[in-house]
């Protein structure tokens, strides 16, 4: 089953991405891999069903710096 979380849509989704990703920026859709040309975007993953922080972070433009 899909993990617990909440749906984020519209401006709320953008605000949350900006908060999570900070100055790294973010993508609405990750570049398609050859194995998955029909990759879904953040809209489908977080507005059309519940998503969590870990999934949101995968849409940040660059990886978080590890301490």
């Amino acid at each position: 089953a899909y993990g617990p979380g909440e749906t984020l849509c519209g401006g709320e989704l953008v605000d949350t991405l900006q908060f999570v990703c900070s100055d790294r920026g973010f993508y609405f859709s990750r570049p398609s891999s050859r194995a998955n040309r029909r990759s879904r975007g953040i809209v489908e993953e977080c507005c059309f069903r519940s998503c969590d922080l870990a999934l949101l972070e995968t849409y940040c433009a660059t990886p978080a710096k590890s301490e």
Epitope: T7, C9, G11, V14, S29, R38, C47, F48
Partner: antibody, heavy 119, light 112 residues
Framework: QVQLQESGPGLVKPSETLSLTCTVS????????WSWIRQPPGKGLEWIGY???????NYNPSLKSRVTISVDTSKNQFSLKLSSVTAADTAVYYC?????????????WGQGTTVTVSS | QSVLTQPPSVSGAPGQRVTISCTGS?????????VHWYQQLPGTAPKLLIY???NRPSGVPDRFSGSKSGTSASLAITGLQADDEADYYC???????????FGGGTKLTVLG
């Protein structure tokens, strides 16, 4: 309260491009998700595509090669272009909005505009 | 053939309870994507009736309720009224198609 109004020609010739516009009132086009849906005579609803003002778009795979959805924020309008139309594209075309408070449900709809493809 | 399967028609007498099913798969309803229900009265645009599986927009009577389990969802209407006669559609997102999908629609007839 957001309101939507579709407009465009009611008759399009086969092989030509269908062009429709949806005018948004009572809300900013920069805030929500916007969709096009169609309904052939006597049949069910078919999703055409949607977009988010940031430029994020997603189209029905069966129509993707022929569809373009674009936005004019200065006029608070978004449009649908469907190329190389055939009689199978005859339908009532609706624009709709996901305001974000309904978990992805399309909570505002235009009244629909009938498009007939015929020579 | 729709990705989400609905019965073509259901009927009931005034005051009765009817349910409309929407059967999907592991790539849509079963993948956790929310299900929405729309009511389309004759000659009018669809109207959002239930969103996020079981939530009613303001103005929709509590006679209408939605539920979801596994790869299926259902819409229940209690205290059936003549003006409930309409077409009803379920909608979700399908990850295999990477797009929104509608059920084929169910025509509700109120008898009598």
């Amino acid at each position: 309260q957001v309101q939507l109004q579709e407009s465009g020609p009611g008759l399009v010739k086969p092989s030509e491009t269908l062009s429709l516009t949806c005018t948004v009132s009572g809300g900013s086009i920069s805030s929500y998700y916007w969709s096009w849906i169609r309904q052939p005579p006597g049949k069910g609803l078919e999703w055409i595509g949607y977009f988010f003002y940031s430029g994020y778009t997603n189209y029905n795979p069966s129509l993707k090669s022929r569809v373009t959805i674009s936005v004019d924020t200065s006029k608070n309008q978004f449009s649908l272009k469907l190329s190389s139309v055939t009689a199978a594209d005859t339908a009532v075309y609706y624009c709709a909005c996901i305001t974000g408070t309904t978990k992805g449900g399309m909570d505002v709809w235009g009244q629909g505009t009938t498009v007939t493809v015929s020579s | 053939q729709s990705v989400l399967t609905q019965p073509p028609s259901v009927s009931g007498a005034p005051g009765q309870r009817v349910t409309i099913s929407c059967t999907g798969s592991s790539s849509n309803i079963g993948a956790g994507y929310d299900v929405h229900w729309y009511q389309q009265l004759p000659g009018t645009a669809p109207k959002l009736l239930i969103y996020g599986n079981n939530n009613r927009p303001s103005g929709v009577p509590d006679r209408f309720s939605g539920s979801k389990s596994g790869t299926s969802a259902s819409l229940a209407i209690t205290g059936l009224q003549a003006d409930d006669e309409a077409d009803y559609y379920c909608q979700s997102f399908d990850s295999s198609l990477s797009g929104s999908v509608f059920g084929g629609g169910t025509k509700l007839t109120v008898l009598g």
